[in-house]
């Protein structure tokens, strides 16, 4: 970068090289060029010469002033005009950054995805800081009082093998950058309470042509957790509102769920599960599309991701079982 150039002088920033966005800043340039008493001193920002707000302080020093500086990053350098030299002589350069101190991390969440071997901790970092911000995740055993710290730039995966201090822990997150430091509230966890079952997947659908046509959705999970509660949501692709069906599930065999749907309509299905009575849900599964036939039976197997599924329409749908209307997005 610009900071690696050979300097014939010195460039510095007040109040600092990294400063709060929107501040007034001064950039100083001091020449120390052999056989040259600078006639003029020039400043460049990102390669473009600045023409105004430059103050010559003395024979060798000038200052460039910026009001309300809002750029996250800029490369600054300054040059001198030496008598009888028509090319400007480079004095020095510096990369400057502006941003914000971190917000207090909130919504700290730690989960163990079944079979992952890791505890994954995430949090809401708050507003964008624009500058390098590091997070230290503190994990303290409530049984042994031993504390471990993990440095990261975003979320963290902690091997469950390293959690040797029993089952109960306090977790909190410290955010720090050049402009400040903040600490989250402490989250108390029990390792047995934060397991999310192995992903539930819809494998296929079929519509059986009976007196009243019936659609069967086949779905499964590799979980070994015995007591699992699941939700399946579905809607016509032209609608916005989801219908939700709830299940207490035993995954020793493939699940079959029955729906009584309108003929000749394209539907979308998703499923998610949690260990019964626990706090965290799986994310919703990939979108599974199924078009009901007009009369003839039809079997499909379409499970794929689609980015435009929630396109903002409403539904009226007929089904058996316990139904609720749902406008929720993906909740953890």
């Amino acid at each position: 970068g610009i900071t690696n150039i050979n300097c014939s002088g010195h460039i510095w920033v007040e109040p600092a090289t990294i400063f709060k966005m929107g501040m007034n800043i001064s950039i100083y340039c001091q020449a120390a060029i052999k056989n040259c008493q600078p006639r003029k001193l020039h400043f460049y920002k990102n390669g473009i010469k600045e023409r105004f707000q430059i103050t010559r302080i003395n024979k060798t020093t000038a200052r460039l002033w910026y009001k309300n500086f809002l750029e996250p990053h800029a490369s600054m350098y300054c040059t001198a005009e030496c008598p009888k030299h028509f090319q400007e002589t480079l004095i020095c350069g510096k990369d400057i950054s502006s941003g914000y101190p971190p917000d207090i991390p909130d919504e700290v969440t730690c989960v163990i995805y079944e079979y992952s071997g890791n505890m994954t901790c995430t949090w809401n970092a708050g507003k964008l800081t624009y500058i390098d911000t590091k997070y230290v995740v503190h994990v303290k055993s409530l049984e042994t009082e031993e504390e471990q710290q993990y440095l990261t730039s975003s979320y963290i995966n902690i091997s469950t093998d390293s959690l040797q201090g029993g089952k109960k822990y306090l977790v909190w997150v410290q955010a720090a950058n050049a402009l400040g430091m903040e600490e989250s509230k402490q989250l108390q966890i029990h390792l047995d309470d934060i397991v999310i079952p192995s992903a539930a997947v819809i494998s296929r659908a079929e519509t059986i042509n009976a007196t009243v046509p019936k659609t069967i959705i086949y779905w499964d999970s590799q979980t070994t957790i015995e007591k699992v509660s699941c939700e399946m949501r579905y809607k016509a692709t032209t609608n916005q509102t989801w219908n939700v069906k709830e299940f207490d599930t035993n995954f020793t065999y493939v699940q079959q769920s029955e729906f009584y749907l309108e003929p000749n309509i394209k539907y979308v299905f998703q499923v998610r599960c949690q260990e019964t009575g626990k706090r965290y849900w799986q994310p919703w599964s990939s979108l599974f599309f199924h078009k009901t036939p007009e009369t003839v039976p039809q079997v499909t197997s379409k499970a794929f991701q689609h980015d435009t599924w929630n396109s903002g329409l409403t539904v009226a749908s007929i089904s058996t079982g316990h139904l609720t209307s749902d406008n929720r997005g993906d909740i953890g």
């Epitope: 006639r39 707000q53 103050t55 010559r56």
Partner: antibody, heavy 118, light 107 residues
Framework: EVKLVESGGGLVQPGSSMKLSCTAS????????MAWVRQVPEKGLEWVAN????????YYLDSLKSRFIISRDNAKNILYLQMSSLKSEDTATYYC???????????WGQGTTLTVSS | DIVLTQSHKFMSTSVGDRVSITCKAS??????VAWYQQKPGQSPKLLIY???TRHTGVPDRFTGSGSGTDFTLTISNVQSEDLADYFC?????????VGGGTKLEIK
């Protein structure tokens, strides 16, 4: 010997244009910034504009930059000031000055007088 | 724009005296200040640059001092030929500006 000789002054009507010239000798013209400074009779000096060695950089008094253009011809050792939409308040003696290596104006011409009147 | 104020429009002194002419800038100009002398019917001449450096050929009875916002031109052992207008100028920030001038009168 450093010598700066201004020319082109005279009486003009408001709204008209005029071009002042300054012929330099006794130094390497292209090595120096040059400037124009004006002085209303019995009043103070007012810096008007300056120009770098090759004419690629110019600066003006804010109130004049829409009407005045400073330029130079290094081959002929001449500095120019093109003035348009002249007003009575532009009436002054116009001095051409060399900006020394230390930035101050170290040599001045004898001045040329411009009178803007109807 | 930076305003340079020379508070005394006129100053009266006698031959052999010492006189100080002041110039105040509306904001910090470091040491980027020059002083000029303009005798009646003549063009200005540079006396001092960088606040305190005498130009070539300027008698050493002329001394400049100051930095930031307050500057002084001191003439010690005033001579009759020093009858003139004296101007300060800042070349710290564009547009360059000039003080209103101080006329030195010899009693």
């Amino acid at each position: 010997e450093v010598k700066l000789v201004e020319s082109g002054g005279g009486l003009v009507q408001p709204g008209s244009s005029m071009k002042l010239s300054c012929t330099a000798s006794g130094f390497t013209f292209s090595d120096y910034y040059m400037a124009w400074v004006r002085q209303v009779p019995e009043k103070g000096l007012e810096w008007v504009a300056n120009i770098n060695y090759d004419g690629s950089n110019t600066y003006y008094l804010d109130s004049l930059k829409s009407r005045f253009i400073i330029s130079r011809d290094n081959a002929k050792n001449i500095l120019y000031l093109q003035m348009s939409s002249l007003k009575s308040e532009d009436t002054a003696t116009y001095y051409c000055a060399r900006e020394g290596y230390d930035e101050a104006m170290d040599y001045w011409g004898q001045g040329t007088t411009l009178t803007v009147s109807s | 724009d930076i305003v340079l104020t020379q508070s005394h429009k006129f100053m009266s002194t006698s031959v052999g005296d010492r006189v100080s002419i002041t110039c105040k800038a509306s904001q910090d100009v470091g040491t980027a200040v020059a002083w000029y002398q303009q005798k009646p019917g003549q063009s200005p001449k540079l006396l001092i640059y960088w606040a305190s450096t005498r130009h070539t050929g300027v008698p050493d009875r002329f001394t400049g001092s100051g930095s930031g916002t307050d500057f002084t031109l001191t003439i010690s052992n005033v001579q009759s030929e020093d009858l003139a207008d004296y101007f300060c100028q800042q070349y710290s920030t564009y547009p360059y500006t000039v003080g209103g001038g101080t006329k030195l009168e010899i009693k």
